[in-house]
């Protein structure tokens, strides 16, 4: 089974690298998840993304969970997901009518 993820190995400033040129095919039977690192800096929000094995992503996200404080300077949030391109842009909230 092969999934695709968005990948940008170096931090991107205010660019969540969720456009087609960042799509990669993950290693079959090894990398079964997508991961994302979001860091909040004074210059703006920085993004890193890649494919990962489930073990690697879960070790990282569990080990650094306490560093995630959204809205706070130097916050670092790691997330893992296991569906194609799931580390892409957050779905926009639909307005209620």
């Amino acid at each position: 089974l092969q999934i695709q993820c968005y990948q940008c190995e170096e931090f991107q400033l205010n660019n969540d690298c969720s456009s087609p040129e960042f799509i990669v095919n993950c290693t079959v039977n090894v990398q079964d998840m997508c991961q994302k690192e979001v860091m909040e800096q004074s210059a703006g929000i920085m993004y890193r993304k890649s494919c990962a094995s489930s073990a690697a992503c879960l070790i990282a996200s569990a080990g650094y969970q306490s560093f995630c404080s959204p809205g706070k300077l130097n916050s670092v949030c790691i997330s893992c997901c296991n569906t194609p391109l799931c580390n892409g842009p957050r779905p926009k909230k639909r307005g209620s009518s």
């Epitope: 190995e9 170096e10 931090f11 993950c26 290693t27 090894v30 990398q31 991961q35 690192e37 860091m39 800096q41 004074s42 210059a43 920085m46 890193r48 890649s50 494919c51 990962a52 094995s53 073990a55 690697a56 070790i59 990282a60 080990g63 650094y64 560093f67 130097n74 670092v76 790691i78």
Partner: antibody, heavy 120, light 107 residues
Framework: EVQLVESGGGLVQPGGSLRLSCAAS????????IHWVRQAPGKGLEWVGR????????YYADSVKGRFTISADTSKNTAYLQMNSLRAEDTAVYYC?????????????WGQGTLVTVSS | DIQMTQSPSSLSASVGDRVTITCRAS??????VAWYQQKPGKAPKLLIY???FLYSGVPSRFSGSGSGTDFTLTISSLQPEDFATYYC?????????FGQGTKVEIK
């Protein structure tokens, strides 16, 4: 217990080649990046490069780009540093270390190092 | 590349002294900085990660602080086993460059 053991160092002539190994135990290398760091006699630490064994993705310092190649055999839980076109300035102790993908993660475990001497 | 400028390059101190080593990054690296201790003929050992977090098993006399571009390693009361060389390293972006090192010697 987590352990990294380097081997393969020795004396080699300028222009020659050498392959270093980094055998890991106590953890699975596919969950980490494996980094190579070197230290010339009496000098500081110099980052050489890294591999993510799960994808094979590598990155190299400019000083070794095009001459050194990092690879991994996940079935053996071992990473390698193939060094070609060696120069006198490559003489150093070579260490391997592990690091999670997360930017905040440090190199938490290191091998004991293996000495490479490039001399005629 | 992100450069790490470490100072001083060496210092002499006595047992019981408070020692401070600084590291300056050439750009904002948030808190993605680690500190290592190295003794002659040995591999580096991790002391501090994420700028201020003490690694498991490291004595509490070691502490780290800073964010952005300026970082500090402090040894609150120098012990005989602390005479060594100390390195900072940024892991914000490749290449993961180290500082030049600070050798702590006995006065």
């Amino acid at each position: 217990e987590v352990q990294l053991v380097e081997s393969g160092g020795g004396l080699v002539q300028p222009g020659g080649s050498l392959r270093l190994s980094c055998a890991a135990s106590g953890f699975t290398i596919t969950n980490y990046g494996i980094h190579w760091v070197r230290q010339a006699p009496g000098k500081g630490l110099e980052w050489v490069g890294r591999i993510y064994p799960d994808s094979g993705a590598t990155y190299y310092a400019d000083s070794v780009k095009g001459r050194f190649t990092i690879s991994a055999d996940t079935s053996k839980n071992t990473a390698y540093l193939q060094m070609n076109s060696l120069r006198a300035e490559d003489t150093a102790v070579y260490y391997c270390a592990r690091k999670l993908w997360v930017s905040l993660a440090p190199m938490d475990y290191w091998g004991q190092g293996t000495l490479v001497t490039v001399s005629s | 590349d992100i450069q790490m400028t470490q100072s001083p390059s060496s210092l002499s101190a006595s047992v019981g002294d408070r020692v401070t080593i600084t590291c300056r990054a050439s750009q904002d690296v948030s808190t993605a900085v680690a500190w290592y201790q190295q003794k002659p003929g040995k591999a580096p050992k991790l002391l501090i990660y994420s700028a201020s977090f003490l690694y498991s098993g490291v004595p509490s006399r070691f502490s780290g602080s800073g964010s952005g571009t300026d970082f500090t390693l402090t040894i609150s009361s120098l012990q005989p086993e602390d005479f060594a060389t100390y390195y900072c390293q940024q892991s914000y972006g490749t290449p993961f460059i180290f500082g030049q090192g600070t050798k702590v010697e006995i006065k």
